[in-house]
Amino acid sequence: KLTIESTPFNVAEGKEVLLLVHNLPQHLFGYSWYKGERVDGNRQIIGYVIGTQQATPGPAYSGREIIYPNASLLIQNIIQNDTGFYTLHVIKSDLVNEEATGQFRVYPELPKPSISSNNSKPVEDKDAVAFTCEPETQDATYLWWVNNQSLPVSPRLQLSNGNRTLTLFNVTRNDTASYKCETQNPVSARRSDSVILNVLYGPDAPTISPLNTSYRSGENLNLSCHAASNPPAQYSWFVNGTFQQSTQELFIPNITVNNSGSYTCQAHNSDTGLNRTTVTTITVYAEPPKPFITSNNSNPVEDEDAVALTCEPEIQNTTYLWWVNNQSLPVSPRLQLSNDNRTLTLLSVTRNDVGPYECGIQNELSVDHSDPVILNVLYGPDDPTISPSYTYYRPGVNLSLSCHAASNPPAQYSWLIDGNIQQHTQELFISNITEKNSGLYTCQANNSASGHSRTTVKTITVSAELPKPSISSNNSKPVEDKDAVAFTCEPEAQNTTYLWWVNGQSLPVSPRLQLSNGNRTLTLFNVTRNDARAYVCGIQNSVSANRSDPVTLDVLYGPDTPIISPPDSSYLSGANLNLSCHSASNPSPQYSWRINGIPQQHTQVLFIAKITPNNNGTYACFVSNLATGRNNSIVKSITVSA
C-alpha cells in the first residue's frame, strides 16, 4: 500500500522536511503533489511525468520544493504555514490512480526565556512573589527549577497560567534560591538565566558573644553582636540604657568595676523596619573573686534525686576545679562535669555523697578555693535492727529491746506487740516477763522527710524449757573443694550453751571446722564428700537441754575419672561388645560415648552385637555433672581380631 512518511514529523521553522514515499507502484505514468488531504488542482504543488522526466510547478508551488524521481518531496526553509497534510497522486500506466496522504507539524525555534517578578524584595512571612516565564508562546510547555532541582512539593508553591506563573506565598528566608524557567516544544527546549530571590527578613533576636558575664578589673571588654537579617542589620549599643555607638562590636579597654551594668545590643533592619534587642548583665570584679558553690538541691533524696553544684562566678579564661572530701574528684559514672568544669552533677545521690565539696578557680597566679559545703542527703529508714538478738527468754527476767534504723533525718520509732501499738520510743522495756509476754515484737521506723517506713518483726518466746533447736544452713548443696557451709543453731537464747555432734560423735579436731558466735555457728571450709554426714546441734542451760533433728549435708562432687568395664581390650570377631562406664559423682552424672571421635549414645552402657574388625578403634566415655558444672572422660582402645 502506498504510504508517505514525514522525516521529521515535527519540523522547526527554517529547517527542511522530506516527504518520503514507500511502496511506490511499478509502471507509472507520473505523479503529482498537492497541499491538503485531497487532490485539488488549485492546490497542486508540483507534477512530474516520468517519460519526459519533466517537473511542472502548480499553483501552490513556493519555489522551496524539490521532487525526486522516486516521488519523494523535499520542502526547504520551512515556514509556519507549511504545517498540515500533503497528498501524493500517482497515475499508473494503465491510467489507474492511487493516492496517499502524509503530514508534518511546524514549530517555531523557541527563544531563550526570561523571568519577570512582581516583587523584587519580598518581606519574610508577609509577602507573596509571582514569577512569570516570558514570553508567552503557543504550544509551549513551561517548567520551573529551584537550585537546579525540580519544584519541591509545598502548599506555599502554586503554579498557574498553564504553569507559566510560579507563585510563592508567605515567603521565608529559606526561599532565597536560584529560580529558572524552561520552555519546551517538540523541536526545542530553552532555559532562562537564574533569578535569585532576595527575601528580606529579620532582624532575629541578636546574640551577644562571648556569653560570659563576669570579668576582672583591668581586662578588655570586647562584645560582639549578631542578628540574622537581610539586608544585614545595623547595630547600636546601649550601656545602662545610654546610647554608646552604632557598631557591631563594642570594645572597652581596661575595664573597672564602674563598667558593670546592663549592656544592650539593638539590631535594626532598614528594609523591614524591624528592631530587636538583647540585654546581658556584665559584672566586673575588683579583684579575683572568691569562688562559691550554688546548688539546685541541697536536700536530695537518696537514689531518687540528682544534684547540680555550680561554681560561681562565671569568669572567662578560667579553669574550674573540684574537690570532694579534700580529694580530687573520683572517677564515677554518677559524677558528671559540664564542658567547662563549672557544674558538677551528682546523679542519683547516695548517703555517702554528703561531701564536703569545694570548688576552685585557677588563674595564672593562683587557685582560689571556695568554702567547703555539704549536702544533706535524705535517706532511709533502712530495715530496722532489733537488739539484742535473743529470741528465747526465761520467765522473771527483764526484756529490754532497742531498735535502730539508719535514717536522715533520724527515724521516729514505734513498737507493736502482736500488732498492737505500745509506745513511740526507740527502746522497749518490760520488767519481770512471763510466758504471756511471748509474741511478735514489731519495730517500725519512719522518716518524716522522705515519708518512707520500714519494719522488722522478732518472735520472742518466754519459757522455762528450752525449745527443740533446729539447724539453718547458708548453703544446702555445697560443691566439693569449692564451697564453705555455715550451720547455725536456732534459736538464739540467753545464757545458753551450744553443742555440736557429727554422726553421733563430738566434733573432730580439724582446721576445716570452726566454731563461732558463742559456738552457735559451725563453719565447714572447703567441703569434701566425706563431710556428707548427719549434723546435730544441742542447747542447754541450768534448767533444760535439747537436741535438734539431724541435718545431712548433701555435698555435690565429681564426676571422678570414669572406669570402663570389663577391662578387656581384645575381642574375637562375632562376639558381643558390652561396655559399662561408671564415675563417682553426686548427683549421678550424664554419660555419653564416642567411637573414634564420633558421638554415639547417651547411656551408661554401650552394646554392639557381633563385632567385626571394623569395630576396631578408640572408645571414649564422657561424664558430666550439671550441678557441679564439671566434666571428665576416659578413652579405651578396642581391637577385634578375625
Epitope: P291, I293, S295
Partner: nanobody
C-alpha cells in the same frame, strides 16, 4: 528546736526602701548558709538572695541585682536583706531559709529550715 523569725516587712511606695531581718535560734548560726526567698500571690516561691555560711560570698537573682543587699551578723545570729529602689513587682511574702554548711541553694530544695515569712507590699 530551730526557729527562723522574719521581721521588717510592711507597705512602702515605689522607689522606697525596707530592711528585712531574720533572727535564728536553736542552731550554730555561723555554720549555716542563709537565703531569702519570696512568693507573690498565685506564684511559686522564688530565690532572691543568699549568703554562704562563712559570709565570704553572696548571690542575687537577676531581678534584684544592684537593688538588694544581703548581709549577716554572726554575733547576733541574724541575716539581713536591704531592699532599695523597690518596685510593685517586688510585692510578696519574704521567707528566710537556712542550710547547714550548705551551698547557696537556688531552689527551695536547697534549704532545710524555713521561717514563717514577712509581707512586703510596694504600692503607691
Amino acid at each position: 528546736e530551730v526557729q527562723l523569725v522574719e521581721s521588717g516587712g510592711g507597705v512602702v511606695q515605689p522607689g522606697g526602701s525596707l530592711r528585712l531581718s531574720c533572727a535564728a535560734s536553736g542552731l550554730t548560726f555561723s555554720t549555716y548558709t542563709m537565703g531569702w526567698f519570696r512568693q507573690a500571690p498565685g506564684a511559686e516561691r522564688e530565690f532572691v538572695a543568699a549568703i554562704i555560711w562563712s559570709g565570704s560570698n553572696t548571690y542575687y537573682a537577676d531581678s534584684v541585682k544592684g537593688r538588694f543587699t544581703i548581709s549577716r551578723d554572726n554575733a547576733k545570729n541574724t541575716v539581713y536583706l536591704q531592699m532599695n529602689s523597690l518596685r510593685p513587682e517586688d510585692t510578696a511574702l519574704y521567707y528566710c531559709a537556712a542550710q547547714h554548711f550548705g551551698p547557696i541553694g537556688l531552689t527551695t530544695r536547697g534549704y532545710h529550715y524555713w521561717g514563717q515569712g514577712t509581707l512586703v507590699t510596694v504600692s503607691s
